[in-house]
C-alpha cells in the first residue's frame, strides 16, 4: 500500500548560465528510501543509492552535482535545460514513487523582468 | 562477460534446508543489488528475495520470509540463499541475477539456474 | 499483490508476422515494467525495461509500449529466433510480480 507522496518544487526557473537545486521530499511513510533517481526526459542525470552514495551519469558530470540531501543542482544552465525533470523514489515496502518538476530556463533579461516562476 | 553460476541444489525432504550459492564474475559483484528468482515446473517465475549491494537491506515475498535467508561475501564473488523449513512448492529451479544498477526491479542478467526438490 | 495477466497464454504465427502480446496489471504501475524472452531449454534474457527501452543488443524489431496498467510487446518480422515464452515483470511495488508467460511457436 503506497501512502507516501513525493513534495516538489514544483515549476520553477532560472536564468541562462546559472545553477538551480531540484528537490523533492517523500513524505507521508515510513518506507525505507533505497535509491533515488533524477532524470530528465528519458536520460539519467544521477543515482543517490543507500549503500554506494551518488554517481553521476557520466555525460553530465561537469554540470550536475549531487544535494543537498537527496536533491540536486544543475550548473551552467542553457535554454535546451528547460523541460520535465523526475526524482523517482525506490522504497521498501512501498514500491517507486515518482516526482515532477518543470524547470525553465530564461535569457538574463527575462529572468529579470517577470520570470514566471520565481526561485525562492 | 556477466557470469553467474548457481549450485548447491538438489532432493530435500519437506521441513529440511538448504543452501544455495551464486559465484558471480565478469563485472563488479560489490556495485550491484543481487536477486535469487525461482522457475516452477509449470514455468511460473517469482521472485524470492533481493540484497543491496553493500548486503545494508533485503526483502522478500511473504511466501518466504521467515524461512529464506539472502546473503552475500563481497569479498568472495558470492551469494546465497540459506533456505530453511522447505515445503513442496519452494520445488523450483532457482536463478540468480543481477539487478539493474539504474532499476533496482529489473533482472538483467541470470544464472544457468540450480533445481531444488522438495519431497518425501 | 499486483497480478499481471498475459494474453494470450500461446501464440502460433508465420515467419515475417507481426505479432503482439499484453500484459495487464491489477494496478496502476506507471512505465515500471520489464520484458523477459526464455528460449527452449535456456535461461530467461532482459529484453525491454521501462516499458519501452531496448535492453543492449535487443534486435530493433522488439518494442515495448505502454503505461499505468496496460502493456504490449511487439515483435515485427517474426525470425525462427525469437521462438519463446514471454513474461512482463513489474517493478512498481514489492512483492516484484510476472505474468504467466506467453509461449510463442512457429506455424
Known amino acids: 500500500m503506497m501512502t507516501g507522496t513525493i513534495e516538489t518544487t514544483g515549476n520553477i526557473s532560472a536564468e541562462k548560465g546559472g545553477s538551480i537545486i531540484l528537490q523533492c521530499h517523500l513524505s507521508s511513510t515510513t518506507a525505507q528510501v533505497t535509491q533515488v533517481n533524477w532524470e530528465q526526459q528519458d536520460q539519467l542525470l544521477a543515482i543517490c543509492n543507500a549503500d554506494l552514495g551518488w554517481h553521476i551519469s557520466p555525460s553530465f558530470k561537469d554540470r550536475v552535482a549531487p544535494g543537498p540531501g537527496l536533491g540536486l543542482t544543475l550548473q551552467s544552465l542553457t535554454v535546451n535545460d528547460t523541460g520535465e525533470y523526475f526524482c523517482i523514489y525506490h522504497t521498501y515496502p512501498d514500491g517507486t514513487y515518482t516526482g515532477r518538476i518543470f524547470l525553465e530556463v530564461l535569457e538574463s533579461s527575462v529572468a529579470e523582468h517577470g520570470a514566471r516562476f520565481q526561485i525562492p | 562477460e556477466v557470469k553467474l553460476v548457481e549450485s548447491g541444489g538438489g532432493l530435500v525432504k519437506p521441513g529440511g534446508s538448504l543452501k544455495l550459492s551464486c559465484a558471480a564474475s565478469?563485472?563488479?559483484?560489490?556495485?550491484?543489488?543481487m536477486s535469487w528468482v525461482r522457475q516452477t515446473p509449470e514455468k511460473r517465475l517469482e521472485w524470492v528475495a533481493v540484497?543491496?549491494?553493500?548486503?545494508?537491506?533485503?526483502f522478500y515475498p511473504d511466501s518466504v520470509k521467515g524461512r529464506f535467508t539472502i546473503s552475500r561475501d563481497n569479498a568472495r564473488n558470492t551469494l546465497y540463499l540459506q533456505m530453511s523449513s522447505l515445503r513442496s512448492e519452494d520445488t523450483a529451479l532457482y536463478f540468480c541475477?543481477?539487478?539493474?544498477?539504474?532499476?533496482?526491479?529489473?533482472?538483467?542478467?541470470w544464472g544457468q539456474g540450480t533445481s531444488v526438490t522438495v519431497s518425501s | 499483490d499486483i497480478q499481471m495477466n498475459q494474453s494470450p497464454s500461446s501464440l502460433s504465427a508465420s515467419l515475417g508476422d507481426t505479432i503482439t502480446i499484453t500484459c495487464h496489471a491489477s494496478?496502476?504501475?506507471?512505465?515500471?515494467l520489464s520484458w523477459y524472452q526464455q528460449k527452449p531449454g535456456n535461461i530467461p534474457k532482459l529484453l525491454i525495461y521501462k516499458a519501452s527501452n531496448l535492453h543492449t543488443g535487443v534486435p530493433s524489431r522488439f518494442s515495448g509500449s505502454g503505461s499505468g496498467a496496460g502493456f504490449t510487446l511487439t515483435i515485427s518480422s517474426l525470425q525462427p529466433e525469437d521462438i519463446a515464452t514471454y513474461y512482463c515483470?513489474?517493478?512498481?511495488?514489492?512483492?516484484?510480480?510476472f505474468g504467466g508467460g506467453t509461449k510463442l511457436e512457429i506455424k
Open positions: 494496478q496502476n504501475i506507471n512505465v515500471w
Open positions: 515483470q513489474q517493478g512498481q511495488s514489492y512483492p516484484w510480480t
Open positions: 540484497i543491496s549491494s553493500g548486503g545494508s537491506y533485503t
Open positions: 565478469g563485472f563488479a559483484f560489490s556495485s550491484f543489488d
Open positions: 541475477t543481477r539487478q539493474d544498477y539504474r532499476y533496482p526491479y529489473i533482472m538483467d542478467y
